[in-house]
Interface confidence: low
């Protein structure tokens, strides 16, 4: 069964910078990745970035840079502008659309006790949402 993992990390050198890493574990090719915060995309979450392997990427503030790390994983850099966007307490969700499996989504957040530079452990179990 395909799975999606999510890691959120705070940059050690820049406490206002966060990076979300997401990956897809499973067969098939990725057709689209959507990253959202505050919940799943279209279900209370706000879209931060859309990455397409051929058409490119698009991101929305406060996302700073979305990029592919491998053919099945992406990273999204975020700029925390202060109290209005408390990333430390926010849930980030990544949805991978793959052919022929469908869509798989998982969410993760920065652990409350995490030190700068440490990342949250991968979230092994996806939200039960296969479109």
């Amino acid at each position: 069964t395909p799975e999606v993992w999510v890691q959120v990390q705070m940059e050690a050198t820049e406490l206002s910078s966060f990076t979300v890493h997401c990956g897809f574990l499973g067969p098939g090719s990725i057709s689209l990745v959507t990253v959202s915060w505050g919940g799943p995309d279209g279900a209370g979450g706000t879209k931060l970035a859309v990455l397409h392997p051929e058409l490119g990427t698009r991101q929305w503030a406060p996302a700073r840079q979305a990029r592919w790390e491998t053919q099945s994983s992406i990273s999204l850099a975020l700029e925390d502008s202060g109290a209005s966007s408390p990333f430390a307490n926010t849930t980030f969700c990544c949805k991978f659309a793959s052919f022929p499996e469908g869509s798989w989504e998982s969410c993760g957040s920065l652990p409350p006790s995490s030190d700068p530079g440490l990342s949250a452990p991968p979230t092994p179990v996806p939200i039960l949402r296969a479109d």
Partner: antibody, heavy 129, light 107 residues
Framework: QVQLQESGPGLVKPSQTLSLTCTVS??????????WSWIRQHPGKGLEWIGY???????SYNPSLKSRVTISVDTSKNQFSLKLSSVTAADTAVYYC?????????????????????WGQGTTVTVSS | EIVMTQSPATLSVSPGERATLSCRAS??????LAWYQQKPGQAPRLLIY???TRATGIPDRFSGSGSGTEFTLTISSLQSEDFAVYYC?????????FGQGTKVEIK
């Protein structure tokens, strides 16, 4: 060509619930790829976004109205509806329904053309006893 | 929510002249900004989306520019049908928010 048409009573009494329906023609709500929104405009004033619904039933509301708003969808009738409870004279406005673009969930290909590209002609609702 | 502020409130321009309308966001909206035109008794019409892309059927005298928090709508040579109210709207975050509008009137 997609067209939207609002319908509902033009006069609502204070404290009652305002109910409007938007009928979509020339395209299917359930094809996905769009947010279906309600926007209102007070007399002589600017535009205020009320909320949206996705064909799946997912909704998002303006925090200033959230406690009073319900937006629902009926894909079998190709309609989406607005209910605004406990209305007062301050809810007197022209109410518009509109289509707000998103990426195409069917193909998985983004459409980089965001914005409310199709609007209904608007319906005037007056709150008065 | 993101507050959108438009200036000026009213712009008096002669036909054939250039009109420049400004829109400021209270925080960055990247390039996710749309412009709408509204005439009396009509629904708004989408002119520009994603800061600078003209919607279908919009003449090239309309152009958008800017990024982040500062945006501009330019009408290069005003035609009689361009006198209307113009609204900016951010589509970066929910809730969608609009500016209060700029009325372009005949000088």
């Amino acid at each position: 060509q997609v067209q939207l048409q609002e319908s509902g009573p033009g006069l609502v009494k204070p404290s009652q619930t305002l109910s409007l329906t938007c009928t979509v023609s020339g395209g299917s709500i359930s094809s996905g790829g769009y947010y279906w929104s309600w926007i209102r405009q007070h007399p002589g004033k600017g535009l205020e976004w009320i909320g949206y619904i996705y064909y799946s039933g997912s909704t998002s509301y303006n925090p200033s109205l959230k406690s009073r708003v319900t937006i629902s969808v009926d894909t079998s009738k190709n309609q989406f509806s607005l209910k605004l409870s406990s209305v007062t004279a301050a809810d007197t406005a022209v109410y518009y329904c509109a289509r707000d673009l998103d990426y195409d969930i069917l193909t998985g290909y983004p459409r980089w053309d965001y914005g409310m590209d199709v609007w209904g002609q608007g319906t005037t609702v007056t709150v008065s006893s | 929510e993101i507050v959108m502020t438009q200036s000026p409130a009213t712009l008096s321009v002669s036909p054939g002249e250039r009109a420049t309308l400004s829109c400021r966001a209270s925080q960055s909206v990247s390039n996710n900004l749309a412009w709408y035109q509204q005439k009396p008794g009509q629904a708004p019409r989408l002119l520009i989306y994603s800061e600078s892309t003209r919607a279908t059927g919009i003449p090239d005298r309309f152009s958008g520019s800017g990024s982040g928090t500062e945006f501009t709508l330019t009408i290069s040579s005003l035609q009689s049908e361009d006198f209307a109210v113009y609204y900016c709207q951010q589509h970066n975050n929910w809730p969608r928010t609009f500016g209060q509008g700029t009325k372009v009137e005949i000088k």
